[in-house]
């Protein structure tokens, strides 16, 4: 989806464990720590020397909804995400570097602690470089590792 164009289940045992309020997670990982604004995320990334992962999405976008579910249920992604400063946005920031090839959703962009947008860490779609689909979780996981690995080699 291009945001410039338009913007009752029974519980199973594992659902009974206490969940944190969704607020900032918006369902992308209720057990993770999420930042509220891009500015805060940049500050935390710089001061903690951890890469930032920015997820752009929309509540009313089927592909955002679908990616959110697999992201939140993917144990390895959720574990690896603990090593990032995390931000999910349902609006566009004024920083054009976060939309290198357009303002579509869902898209995931990595920023390193030097505040450089990692435009080189891309998905598999040539027309939407930072888009991921539910079938792309392995690639997303690898890209997260790449962001962490490259960060370590740059220290």
């Amino acid at each position: 989806k291009d945001t410039t164009v338009k913007s009752g289940a029974k519980k199973d045992p594992k659902d009974s464990r206490p969940k944190l309020p969704q607020t900032l997670s918006r369902g992308w990982g209720d057990q993770l720590i999420w930042t509220q604004t891009y500015e805060e995320a940049l500050y935390r990334s710089k001061t903690s020397n951890r890469p930032l992962m920015v997820i752009h999405h929309l509540d009313e976008c089927p592909h955002s909804q679908a990616l959110k579910k697999v992201f939140a249920e993917h144990k390895e992604i959720q574990k690896l995400a603990e090593q990032f400063v995390l931000l999910n946005l349902v609006y566009e920031t004024t920083d054009k570097h976060l939309s290198p090839d357009g303002q579509y959703v869902p898209r995931i962009v990595f920023v390193d602690p030097s505040l450089t947008v990692r435009a080189d860490i891309t998905g598999r779609y040539s027309n939407r470089l930072y888009a991921y689909e539910p079938s792309d979780t392995a690639l997303l996981y690898d890209n997260m590792k790449k962001a962490l690995k490259l960060l370590k080699t740059e220290l």
């Epitope: 338009k6 009752g8 289940a9 659902d15 976008c61 679908a66 579910k69 697999v70 539910p134």
Partner: antibody, heavy 120, light 107 residues
């Protein structure tokens, strides 16, 4: 193999409600979206809405939003579509259709359909 | 809502013919388009998703192409069992919307 088995035909009076079930097997129930689609006699296909059985999240076609409720029962791997305030124009075959196996939105497998007739 | 305009609404072709059905979206839907085959009294069957990906078990004579607003379903060599109505579906945006259908008959 994947199977979606729907409940039998229903005849309802105008103003009544109907609840159609779709019992699934052969895949991880909680991790695929389930869509509902209807087809009036001799007409095309119309999307009603979808539900994620894992947590019950739904999205409805605005045309049906006030009258339709989708639910899921993980203990029986069954999804339900309830349509209220029935009118004659709701006479149609109602299909459940599973999303992609990996959680993708595309419709992959279809139930056999349930004919709902609304008549006084 | 996104409108899906399918054409032709019906066609008649001979066994072995190449058959092409088109679907046009009222706005860009990327590649989020599926094609379905429906025979009388039966549930639809999914043939293609993401514009050009063939569903497992579907004969290779079926293919899909296109992106953005214009999409095509091609049957390279029409077989008697292909007699059915074909529908496209956009799933880029809520509500998902179907084309009006194309009825394929044998000459």
């Amino acid at each position: 193999q994947v199977q979606l088995v729907q409940s039998g035909a229903e005849v309802k009076k105008p103003g009544a409600s109907v609840k159609v079930s779709c019992k699934t097997s052969g895949y991880v129930f909680s991790r695929s979206w389930m869509n509902w689609v209807r087809q009036a006699p001799g007409q095309g296909l119309e999307w009603i809405g979808w539900i994620y059985p894992g947590d019950g999240d739904t999205n409805y076609n605005g045309k049906f939003k006030d009258r339709v409720t989708l639910t899921a029962d993980k203990s029986t791997s069954t999804v339900y579509m309830e349509l209220s305030s029935l009118r004659s124009e709701d006479t149609a075959v109602y299909f459940c259709a599973r999303g992609g196996y990996d959680g993708s939105p595309w419709l992959s497998y279809w139930g056999q359909g349930t004919l709902v007739t609304v008549s006084s | 809502d996104i409108q899906m305009t399918q054409s032709p609404s019906s066609l008649s072709a001979s066994v072995g013919d190449r058959v092409t059905i088109t679907c046009k979206a009222s706005q860009d839907i990327n590649s989020y388009l599926s094609w379905f085959q429906q025979k009388p009294g039966k549930a639809p069957k999914t043939l293609i998703y993401r514009a050009n990906r063939l569903v497992d078990g579907v004969p290779s004579r079926f293919s899909g192409s296109g992106s953005g607003q214009d999409f095509t379903l091609t049957i390279s060599s029409l077989q008697p069992e292909d007699i059915a109505t074909y529908y496209c579906l956009q799933y880029d945006e809520f509500p998902f919307t179907f084309g009006g259908g194309t009825k394929v008959e044998i000459k």
